[in-house]
């Protein structure tokens, strides 16, 4: 990463360094000391303190994004005198060069699509490269198939998802031989990204006086039980007037998925559609194929 | 309509091993998860271990670890629970139950529970 | 010791409202970790009433809900009836530990 690191030291200094790839900082160790402690200010003037390693001459930050740069700040007392050292990381490179409008999403259960646009200011050669790490491992996965405009990398897409964790730590660089470009980096939560399918296997039965609706939960990335989805049914009668509202239901996950309703004989063609969502979010899936039923002289 | 049946009541003597035994009926086990949970009346509600998807395997409480093994046959549907090297303190009722929510696992669906007598 | 801490017991008369807390720290029900609440019949086994905090699963009734905010969840019973009369318990997880954890429990009179 082509990031400066400045270092505002007094003269006896504690050689405070940051490796973004573990993100951990670290310094010369001081014997006898009494005291230590490590933090970060952002541009927003908030302050991140981690907990120390156990040596105490470095500390490991889990959840920072670094792109709008920070400060790291070491203060160290001994038995003889107190450290302080400021350690700069700016984004370094032209202002308007990094990837910007970046989102990814999850779809199909087990697929990743990641997608931004080139910096206004960055130069026709530039070339972005994403890094995924996630939070437990710190594994660093590669973007393994480029979306590309005219040569340029605006996308990655994986097929191979084992290598995530429910939060995970995304960083775009960039190249470029004219000048410096900027990095942008991002924390995604797995489930706020994930786009469900709709649900499967939807099947209608009546009898003279009612209709049972079934239907299975969808393939999920995110490792999900019955109560944690939320389903909406729309049962449409066919063939009404424009504007007549369709009737939405809402419906919790249950071990079995089924909604029974009133409908007796002879019955209008009917049709019924269903979508799925994080009972926590809501981010509805898009609907299942109308199934229809019921017959057209009901 | 899901049950979960359990193995009948076990007296057993400091030392020995208890297998207890959970059928689930009316869904398939593979498409579950699995979890135990003893209670006594003076330590309350004991989480001892279960099925967690994230890992993709059987995860044990810490303080149970070398002792309990829980197994299952998903071919007849049955979870087990087998806790070794017994002591007085292990005397407790023992429930199997069913996750129904992996955010903060709520237990859905459980057994009548087994209990465990263990006494010399 | 239970990780999560409840009152030993609450009483109501028939219709009253009652509430019962459950105290955590930062590595369970402030972590966040959602919280579930289960009833206990007397010779039976607990019930599910409440998940993800606040949500009840099908055939509870809505006289029981729940809230949670910070370290602390509680769960409430409107219109308090004579079979409410049972032993509640909170639930969560604990990353600290990395287990499951349960309050004491809160015994329910109905006077």
């Known amino acids: 990463e082509k990031s400066d690191l400045r270092t505002v030291a007094p003269a006896s200094s504690l050689n405070v360094r940051f490796d973004s790839r573990t993100m951990n900082l670290s310094w010369d160790c001081q014997e006898n000391t009494t005291f230590s402690k490590c933090f970060l200010t952002d541009k927003k003037n908030r302050v991140v303190e981690p907990r120390l390693s156990n040596n105490e001459c470095s500390c490991t930050f889990r959840e920072i994004c670094l792109h709008e740069g920070v400060t790291f700040e070491v203060h160290v007392n001994t038995s003889q005198r107190g450290f302080q050292q400021k350690l700069l990381y700016p984004n370094s490179g032209r202002e308007g060069t990094a990837a910007q409008n970046f989102s990814c999403f999850i779809y199909n259960a087990d697929l990743m699509n990641c997608t931004w646009a080139r910096g206004p200011t960055a130069p026709r050669d530039v070339q972005y490269f994403l890094y995924i790490r996630n939070s437990k491992r710190r594994r660093e996965i590669r973007c393994p198939y480029y979306i590309q405009d005219s040569g340029t990398h605006v996308g990655c897409h994986l097929d191979n998802l084992s290598g995530l964790t429910s939060r995970n730590y995304f960083l775009v660089n960039g190249t470029s031989r004219e000048i410096g470009i900027q990095f942008f980096d991002s924390l995604l939560d797995t489930k706020k990204i994930e786009r469900f399918n709709p649900p499967s296997n939807v099947t209608v039965r009546c009898n003279t006086t009612h209709c049972l609706v079934r239907w299975k939960q969808p393939r999920t990335y995110q490792k999900l039980s019955y109560l944690d989805f939320q389903y909406q049914l729309d049962v449409h009668r066919k063939n009404t007037q424009p504007g007549t509202e369709n009737l939405l239901i809402n419906v919790s996950g249950d071990l079995e998925n089924r909604y029974n309703f009133p409908s007796s004989e002879p019955r209008a063609k009917h049709s019924v559609k269903i979508r799925a969502a994080d009972v926590r979010i809501l981010n509805w899936s898009s609907w299942s194929e109308a199934i229809e039923f019921g017959s057209d002289d009901g | 309509q899901v049950q979960l049946v359990q193995s009948g009541a076990e007296v057993k003597k400091p030392g020995a091993s208890v297998k207890v035994s959970c059928k689930i009926s009316g869904h398939s086990l593979s498409e579950l998860s699995i979890h135990w949970v003893r209670q006594t009346p003076t330590k309350g509600f004991e989480w001892m271990g279960g099925f967690d998807p994230e890992e993709n395997e059987i995860v044990y409480a810490q303080r149970f670890q070398g002792r309990v093994t829980m197994t299952e046959d998903t071919s007849i549907d049955t979870a087990y629970l087998t806790l070794s090297s017994l002591r007085s303190d292990d005397t407790a009722v023992y429930y199997c139950?069913?996750?129904?929510?992996?955010?903060?696992?709520?237990?859905?669906?459980w057994g009548k529970g087994t209990m465990v007598t263990v006494s010399s | 010791q239970a990780v999560l801490t409840q009152p030993s017991s609450v009483s109501g008369a028939p219709g009253q409202r009652v509430t019962i807390s459950c105290t955590g720290s930062?590595?369970?029900?402030?972590?966040?970790?959602?919280v579930s609440w289960y009833q206990q019949l007397p010779g039976t086994a607990p019930k599910l009433l409440i998940y993800?905090?606040?949500k009840r699963p099908s055939g509870v009734p809505d006289r029981f809900s729940a809230s949670k905010s910070g370290t602390s969840a509680s769960l409430a019973i409107t219109g308090l009836q004579a079979d409410d009369e049972a032993d509640y318990y909170c639930?969560?997880?604990?990353?600290?530990?990395?287990?499951?954890?349960f309050g004491g429990g809160t015994k329910v009179t109905v006077l």
């Open positions: 930062g590595s369970n029900i402030g972590a966040p970790y959602d």
């Open positions: 639930q969560s997880y604990d990353s600290r530990t990395g287990i499951i954890v």
């Open positions: 993800h905090n606040n």
């Open positions: 139950s069913i996750v129904g929510s992996f955010s903060g696992w709520a237990f859905d669906y």
